[in-house]
């Protein structure tokens, strides 16, 4: 058993049929010595008396808010949560496996630049009685500070018969050094509590590996005289690291119709303009990627050809 | 060329070669389909490699003030990786495929380090640690880790030379 926060405790249980469970001793936070009784949740049934209560925790019915009283007055609370371990593996019932970029990916994180600011998000089908708390650091043995905000519900989607909820959190490295080569990864730890179930999820990454620039901005077209070609120009996204002579991007320019199966024109460039062939009913799209490190491409920025 | 304590490097040449290094480093070990190396106990094997750190003057301001500190750090790293790529980690079993870009990568690391430091001038170089894995699978894992680490190192070096070519070239 360990303390998650004040008066909230996590009991780690091996979860299998007829498991013996864990013996837990609760102590009432009071100078009083006698006349103390214990109850669980809303029940008035007295579970025991005395300053300490010993219980055998085997299942969710044994978890919950234990309260010690004296003469009708509440002295203190202890909330017990369960953390299940099945076949040596901690449960992951609360969050959905996003399966990208690999199986058992519960947390996904992205950064728009090298400033040390990043966003993580996760998915669940649970809509109520759900809380998250997020901690982060650079490295684990001698951790350097990363400050994370509160996790918030950022999107709701309908997937077949189910509703899916996306939560996200923004974090900022306290003393970021954008130009340095990272040697220690960022660690992100998410505590998830659903009713009386506790789970924790972690992710470890370098900012360089989660970079995904915003799409290029201000796409403009200039038809070339006596030609099917147009010059398309764009600018670096505002959110990208500066100066651009140091933090350079490379671009992919594509002309394509509405369907992916349609023919296309495609060219890669380090410049912020390119000449392509425009077709009626097609769009010109541009996306960006770090020029020197193969992290994710941005989403496409598009303008119609006509 | 960058002479210790002295003149500017051939920024444009260094830019071209460092960008080539980036391409080679990624073709030697594409990201796709490989194990997540951080799960394999990264610390003890790749902590010894030289990293371009915050105080090394490789940021745009540091380069403007005095690029020599940064260039020396890059040179140290290039020599270090060049030695690693020539060591039995890469020459031993399992043999690299003959079409592996590691050979080109090795030659290009040497080429860039020579551009930065002509013969007869010496910057202090870092000792290469004795990483001698006994098992072929350990060697394979170590290669992946070294190449991943090299990708990050050459990316920073390429940014330095691109910025230098754009803003510090005479």
């Amino acid at each position: 058993i360990w303390e998650l926060k004040k008066d909230v405790y996590v009991v780690e249980l091996d979860w299998y049929p007829d498991a013996p469970g864990e013996m837990v001793v609760l102590t009432c936070d009071t100078p009083e010595e006698d006349g103390i009784t214990w109850t669980l949740d809303q029940s008035s049934e007295v579970l025991g008396s005395g300053k300490t209560l010993t219980i055998q925790v085997k299942e969710f019915g044994d978890a919950g808010q234990y309260t010690c009283h004296k003469g009708g007055e509440v002295l203190s609370h202890s909330l017990l949560l369960l953390h299940k371990k099945e076949d040596g593996i901690w449960s992951t019932d609360i969050l959905k496996d996003q399966k990208e970029p690999k199986n058992k990916t519960f947390l996904r994180c992205e950064a728009k630049n090298y400033s040390g600011r990043f966003t993580c998000w996760w998915l669940t089908t649970i809509s109520t009685d759900l809380t998250f708390s997020v901690k982060s650091s650079r490295g684990s043995s001698d951790p350097q500070g990363v400050t994370c905000g509160a996790a918030t519900l950022s999107a709701e989607r309908v997937r077949g018969d189910n509703k899916e909820y996306e939560y996200s959190v923004e974090c900022q490295e306290d003393s970021a050094c954008p130009a340095a080569e990272e040697s220690l990864p960022i660690e992100v730890m998410v505590d998830a509590v659903h009713k009386l179930k506790y789970e924790n999820y972690t992710s470890s990454f370098f900012i360089r590996d989660i970079i995904k620039p915003d799409p290029p901005k201000n796409l403009q077209l200039k038809p070339l005289k006596n030609s099917r070609q147009v010059e398309v120009s764009w600018e670096y996204p505002d959110t990208w690291s500066t100066p651009h002579s140091y933090f350079s991007l490379t671009f992919c320019v594509q002309v394509q119709g509405k369907s992916k199966r349609e023919k296309k024109d495609r060219v890669f460039t380090d410049k912020t303009s390119a000449t392509v062939i425009c077709r009626k009913n097609a769009s010109i799209s541009v996306r960006a990627q770090d020029r020197y490190y193969s992290s994710s491409w941005s989403e496409w920025a598009s303008v119609p050809c006509s | 060329r960058a002479v210790p304590g002295g003149s500017s490097p051939a920024w444009t040449q260094c830019q071209q070669l460092s960008q080539k290094l980036c391409t080679l480093a990624w073709s030697a070990h594409p990201l796709v389909g490989h194990m997540d190396l951080r799960e394999e106990g990264d610390e003890e094997t790749t902590n010894d490699v030289p990293h371009i750190q915050c105080g090394d003057g490789c940021d745009p301001q540091g380069l403007r003030d005095n690029s020599q500190f940064c260039l020396q750090r890059i040179h140290q790293g290039l020599i270090f990786y060049e030695k690693l790529l020539g060591s039995d980690i890469f020459t031993g079993e399992p043999s690299l495929l003959p079409d592996s870009p590691v050979g080109q990568l090795h030659a290009s690391l040497l080429g860039l380090s020579q551009l930065l430091q002509p013969e007869g001038h010496h910057w202090e170089t870092q000792q290469i640690p004795s990483l001698s894995p006994s098992q072929p699978w350990q060697r394979l894992l170590l290669r992946f880790k070294i190449l991943r680490s090299l990708q990050a190192f050459v990316a920073v070096a390429a940014r330095v030379f691109a910025h230098g070519a754009a803003t510090l070239s005479p």
Epitope: E262, K263, R266, V267, T275, I277 | -
Partner: antibody, heavy 118, light 107 residues
């Protein structure tokens, strides 16, 4: 199977015009760009121009501008290359090539030898 | 027009050898570079597109790399059917241009 079948060899006199054809099969003709590339004897490859069969848009290499016409007939799934004012240096194998991507060539015809000789 | 220079113009090699052909562009072309193989009396065949992307059906012994101005095609463990002429082609801008070709012949 995507295939391009070209018309047979031609012998022409200097100053004449040649028109060669390229019949597509195994795909929807207007879904691919069609290019013409030539290769003089023992020489390299030279791109001449392309057509979008869907709308008839064309683009020609400056070297051939004014002498070359590329057309496409979607009713017969056939592309054509017409080269006028022939000279001896136009002696070459002419290839049609197609791709869904505009700038490189995925499928090639077998080639048509055009000999220009007086 | 962008000039493409291939080297060497010919190379003699034996079955099992590793052969590397290089292609240099007269200006930076990012990764807009493609490789073709041509056997005598036949049409060219696409091997690699956008510098390093492999084509399904093309043996994995063919690999490409490079960006900017310098590119290479490597044939690992040359097979009898690989003796042919190889061309690079830039697609950075029109007119599309090819290298002069490299003939890989039997030693």
């Amino acid at each position: 199977e995507v295939q391009l079948v070209q018309s047979g060899a031609e012998v022409k006199k200097p100053g004449a015009t040649v028109k060669i054809s390229c019949k597509a099969s195994g795909y929807t003709f207007s879904d691919y760009y069609l290019h013409w590339v030539r290769q003089a004897p023992e020489k390299g490859l030279e791109w001449m121009g392309w057509i979008d069969p869907e709308n008839g848009d064309t683009e020609y290499a400056p070297k051939f501008q004014g002498r070359v016409t590329i057309t496409a007939d979607t009713s017969t799934d056939t592309g054509y290359l017409e080269l006028s004012s022939l000279r001896s240096e136009d002696t070459a194998v002419y290839y049609c090539a197609a791709n869904k991507e505009l700038r490189y060539f995925d499928v090639w015809g077998q080639g048509t030898l055009v000999t220009v000789s007086s | 027009d962008i000039q493409m220079t291939q080297s060497p113009s010919s190379v003699s090699a034996s079955v099992g050898d590793r052969v590397t052909i290089t292609c240099r562009a007269s200006q930076s072309i990012s990764i807009n570079l493609h490789w073709y193989q041509q056997k005598p009396g036949k049409a060219p065949k696409l091997l690699i597109y956008f510098a390093s992307q492999s084509i399904s059906g093309v043996p994995s012994r063919f690999s490409g790399s490079g960006s900017g101005t310098d590119f290479s095609l490597t044939i690992n463990s040359l097979q009898p059917e690989d003796f042919a002429r190889y061309y690079c082609q830039q697609s950075n801008s029109f007119p599309l241009t090819f290298g002069g070709g490299t003939k890989v012949e039997i030693k």
